[in-house]
């Protein structure tokens, strides 16, 4: 469906004559009849298959026709059609003289025709006007024309119906070619599918209107990307809904059993950091200067011989300090103020000057090293100590300081943690994969059975005859204070009656 529009612009009839050559009296009062029809190679009379339209009297003899579309007038002339525009047409425009007010064909004399033009050709649908001018011996007509689609019709031949909508059945406007253009926030073939909140999880979230994110069961959060753990889960998380994966230090079905050995037992000494590594096991990360399973052993930072050029090392609370020999300075006595003239090379090292004597380099004999050949070659560089043992240079030799649980020249032998009898007060020691555990006798507790927990020896009511019972805390035994008339360690004998001994 569309409209063929014809805009008449100018008609010239300077002599004011009819087609017959006869002049109009007093002038040619001119109106037009338009016939639009299917394409004909030779335009011939017959039905105006695409439509007809007539104008009122537009002027006399020669005149310009003003554009009257804005005022609701009839220029451009409208020839609507209710079919697919074929792309070709034939057009007949007749100019007639109106002697009176009746413009009906039957009311006009047959010789009232002023001029007749006929054109045919191709015409694509579009907004642009095609300008044309037709001239006969006596007249000239200038006009333009175009084909546009009716409202809600689109495409090359106005055959595509598209009506914008914003309701349950779609949310779109129409493009010039009749395709749908979804309103913001909608997608899909008919723009019925809302675009969810940006980032809304594809599987776990959905939406019923644009820019929202509704969560499916078991999911939550702004983007429905956080799972909800199993109901009752206390110290756990999930990667899929209703799981309960325990946080570090917690166990049990609902992650409500505390496995945080570090917090409850504080086993690490000397400011070390404690890390739980499973039920009842832990790892201590020692501060510099300490070693041992519980960081209970103090290291000398001077053991690594940090002072160069014969500097002597002094241990300090927060590290060490190098006392440099004359001619050296720096944190490790690494800077020299000497030259070869000062004979700075020890142990038979030979001196070579550098930078025009500004400084020097020592070439050391075997078994000595250091910038001044002041150090014996460190026998610890090959890391001879096994199982985390610490290598210490001791004069001409070396020794390994072993971690607890290891022994041997190179700490290569594994010692049972229980070998050093760590459990106090007769506790029973059990070797574990990550250490040891003490089973304490009655009256003692703690990791090493070092805590005395007093036993109430009177709890079993050992005293007879209403005697008062006292616990001896030093021996965890009881003492009975007998009432008058009774004796014996448990006040079991009346006074005057000798005990009956079995012998």
């Amino acid at each position: 469906s569309g409209v063929f529009q014809l805009q008449l612009q100018e008609f010239i009839n300077e002599r004011g004559v009819l087609a017959s050559g006869r002049p109009c009296e007093p002038g040619c009062r001119t109106f037009f009849r338009v016939c639009l029809k299917h394409f004909q190679a030779v335009v011939s009379p017959g039905p105006c298959t695409f439509g007809t339209v007539s104008t009122p009297v537009l002027g006399t003899n020669s005149f310009a026709v003003r554009d009257d579309s804005s005022g609701g007038g009839r220029n451009p002339l409208q020839l609507p059609f209710n079919f697919t525009w074929p792309g070709t047409f034939s057009l007949i425009i007749e100019a007639w003289h109106a002697p009176g007010d009746d413009l009906r064909p039957e009311a006009l004399p047959p010789d009232a025709l002023i001029s007749k033009i006929a054109i045919q050709g191709s015409l694509a649908v579009g907004q642009n006007w095609l300008l044309d001018e037709q001239t006969s011996t006596l007249t000239r007509l200038r006009y333009s024309y175009r084909v546009i689609c009716s409202d809600n019709y689109y495409g090359d031949n106005c055959s595509r119906l598209c009506k914008k909508r914003n309701d349950h059945f779609g949310h779109y406007v129409c493009q010039p070619d009749g395709n749908l253009s979804c309103l913001p926030g909608w997608t899909g073939e008919y723009c019925q599918q809302p675009i969810c909140l940006s980032g809304c999880h594809e599987q776990n979230g959905y939406c019923s209107k644009p820019a929202e994110c509704l969560c499916r069961p078991g999911w939550q959060g702004r983007l429905c990307n956080e799972c909800i753990p199993h109901n009752g889960c206390r110290h756990g998380t999930c990667s899929t809904p209703w799981q309960c994966t325990c946080d570090e230090g917690w166990g049990g079905l609902f992650c409500d059993q505390d496995l945080n050995y570090c917090t409850h037992h504080s086993p690490c000494k000397n400011g070390a950091t404690c890390s739980n590594s499973g039920q009842r096991s832990y790892t201590c990360t020692c501060r510099p200067g300490y070693t041992g399973v519980d960081c209970e052993l103090e290291l000398s930072e001077c053991d690594s011989n940090p002072c160069r050029n014969g500097g002597s090392c002094k241990d300090q609370e927060d590290g060490y300090h190098c006392l440099c020999p004359p001619g050296y300075y720096g944190l490790h006595c690494e800077h020299s103020t000497l030259s070869c003239a000062d004979s700075p090379c020890f142990n038979g090292g030979s001196c070579r000057e550098r930078n025009q004597g500004a400084n020097y380099a020592c070439e050391c004999p075997p078994n000595f090293t250091g910038s001044n050949c002041e150090k014996k070659v460190d026998r610890c560089t090959s890391n001879p100590c096994a199982n985390g043992g610490q290598c210490l240079n001791r004069g001409p030799s070396r020794m390994c300081r072993c971690r607890p649980g290891f022994t041997g020249t190179y700490c290569e032998l594994h010692v049972s943690d229980c070998a050093r009898n760590p459990c106090a007060h007769g506790g029973t020691c059990h070797d574990l994969e990550n250490g040891l555990m003490c089973t304490c006798p009655a009256g003692f507790s703690g990791r090493r059975c070092e805590v005395r927990t007093s036993i109430d020896a009177c709890a079993s009511s050992p005293c007879f005859n209403r005697a008062t019972c006292y616990t001896d805390l030093s021996t965890d035994t009881f003492v009975c204070n007998c009432p008058y008339g009774f004796v014996g360690s448990r006040c079991e004998f009346p006074v005057g009656l000798p005990p009956s001994f079995p012998w």
Partner: nanobody, 123 residues
Framework: EVQLVESGGGLVQPGGSLRLSCAAS????????MSWVRQAPGKGPEWVSA????????YYADSVKGRFTISRDNAKNTLYLQMNNLKPEDTAVYSC????????????????WGQGTQVTVSS
């Protein structure tokens, strides 16, 4: 059975403060995001603030940003809303809720609501 019980509302002068509480039961409170919603007389529900399950992320409507603070105590199964510099337009019934869906500004669909507590700001 899920229960959300709000308290702490009342009459307060403009510029004053109130602290609302929401006691939760019947579900594992610490596993769920929570939200505060308000409804003024003759108006629809308006999202106020939200907090994630762990309490590390908080969200506020533009109308309350900088004046209200949401928090939670998972050990006590309680949600809080500290309201400072209150204005007459804050007058409403305030409810805590478990959000089920979010829009571009905040939660707008809820799995459960409490009955609410009335807050009136007037001189």
């Amino acid at each position: 059975e899920v229960q959300l019980v709000e308290s702490g509302g009342g009459l307060v002068q403009p510029g004053g403060s109130l602290r609302l509480s929401c006691a939760a039961s019947g579900f594992t409170f610490g596993s769920y995001d929570m939200s505060w919603v308000r409804q003024a007389p003759g108006k629809g529900p308006e999202w106020v603030s939200a907090i994630n399950s762990g309490g590390g992320s908080t969200y506020y409507a533009d109308s309350v940003k900088g004046r209200f603070t949401i928090s939670r105590d998972n050990a006590k199964n309680t949600l809080y809303l500290q309201m400072n510099n209150l204005k007459p337009e804050d007058t409403a019934v305030y409810s805590c809720a478990i959000p089920r869906g979010w829009g571009p500004t905040g939660p707008h669909e809820y799995a459960y609501w409490g009955q609410g507590t009335q807050v009136t700001v007037s001189s």
